[in-house]
Interface confidence: medium
Amino acid sequence: KVFGRCELAAAMKRHGLDNYRGYSLGNWVCAAKFESNFNTQATNRNTDGSTDYGILQINSRWWCNDGRTPGSRNLCNIPCSALLSSDITASVNCAKKIVSDGNGMNAWVAWRNRCKGTDVQAWIRGCRL
């Protein structure tokens, strides 16, 4: 599923991401935009042999199990394919674990490069939340 901007903002808010660990909803929507272009089925392969999955491009080396990433930790204890569902529950729950890990949203390279320090509230402007 490819979410609309406001549709995703509403879903993320419903799942408790607004101000989760101090990150406003705009940060999460911005991260999703630049990680996956709001596409729940996005997959991207990395040079270390891992793959990023889903709307928040969660990595198989650390967070989920895709059965083929050497040394996978699977810290979210889920199959990576669950992160590709049109229901973002699994991605959100795993993202909450990631953002609580110590580096906050710096874990997402796209957030660090494209969202951090910008007017992230623009990503939820005009949305009925």
Epitope: Q41, T43, T47, G49, D66, R68, T69, P70, C80
Partner: antibody, heavy 115, light 107 residues
């Protein structure tokens, strides 16, 4: 137990297309990548590409882009590979395998003859 | 693409001999190298994964070693059922690639 069952041998004319199937049983089909591998005598094994059935995400070896197309039907736990514009170079045995980085589970192979 | 070069192309041995098959990668692939055996008209069978991990059900006379660019499959005291083709495969990066194979034949 995990099994991959491929469709039977095919004999096709040059220029035609063929669709090979790979039915998976014994595991959660949507969770694992299915890989496709080509084997020609004297050419060893070549990785064609892969599909994640749960999402339809696909990756192709550059060499096979435009030649192979992967699809999957999660209702029947079956992956498909279509090969188009067939030539004699496409005559080979085609295998599906479960993509665990390494390939422990293989189909029995589908022999394609183009003549 | 990562190229895998296997040597020798053919190895003629007598049952009871011990042999070593080589697989060399064109760049470092850590331990992401797997070995397969294939007999005529059969699918490949995974023998060893990640350089040295023997798969369940594979006889202990098979062993794998190496890391980086140089890998070896060893068979201690070859048995008649071991004759066939041996391939290496890397899973360090895409596209996945295979070596050209080593044919193990009876002398």
């Amino acid at each position: 137990q995990v099994q991959l069952q491929e469709s039977g041998a095919e004999v096709m004319k040059p220029g035609a297309s063929v669709k090979i199937s790979c039915k998976a049983t014994g595991y959660t089909f949507t969770t694992y990548w299915i890989e496709w591998v080509k084997q020609r005598p004297g050419h060893g094994l070549e990785w064609i590409g892969e599909i994640l059935p749960g999402s339809g995400s696909t990756y192709y070896n550059e060499k096979f882009k435009g030649k192979a197309t992967f699809t999957a039907d999660t209702s029947s736990n079956t992956a498909y590979m279509q090969l188009s514009s067939l030539t004699s170079e496409d005559s080979a045995v085609y295998y599906c395998a479960r993509g665990d980085g390494n390939y422990y589970y293989w189909g029995q192979g589908t022999t394609l003859t183009v003549s | 693409d990562i190229e895998l070069t296997q040597s020798p192309a053919t190895l003629s041995v007598t049952p009871g001999d011990s042999v070593s098959l080589s697989c060399r990668a064109s760049q470092s692939i850590s331990n992401n190298l797997h070995w397969y055996q294939q007999k005529s008209h059969e699918s490949p069978r995974l023998l060893i994964k990640y350089g040295s991990q023997l798969m369940s059900g594979i006889p202990s006379r098979f062993s794998g070693s190496g890391s980086g660019t140089d890998f070896t499959l060893s068979i201690n005291s070859v048995e008649t059922e071991d004759f066939g083709m041996y391939f290496c495969q890397q899973s360090n990066s895409w596209p996945r690639t295979f070596g050209g194979g080593t044919k193990l034949e009876i002398k």
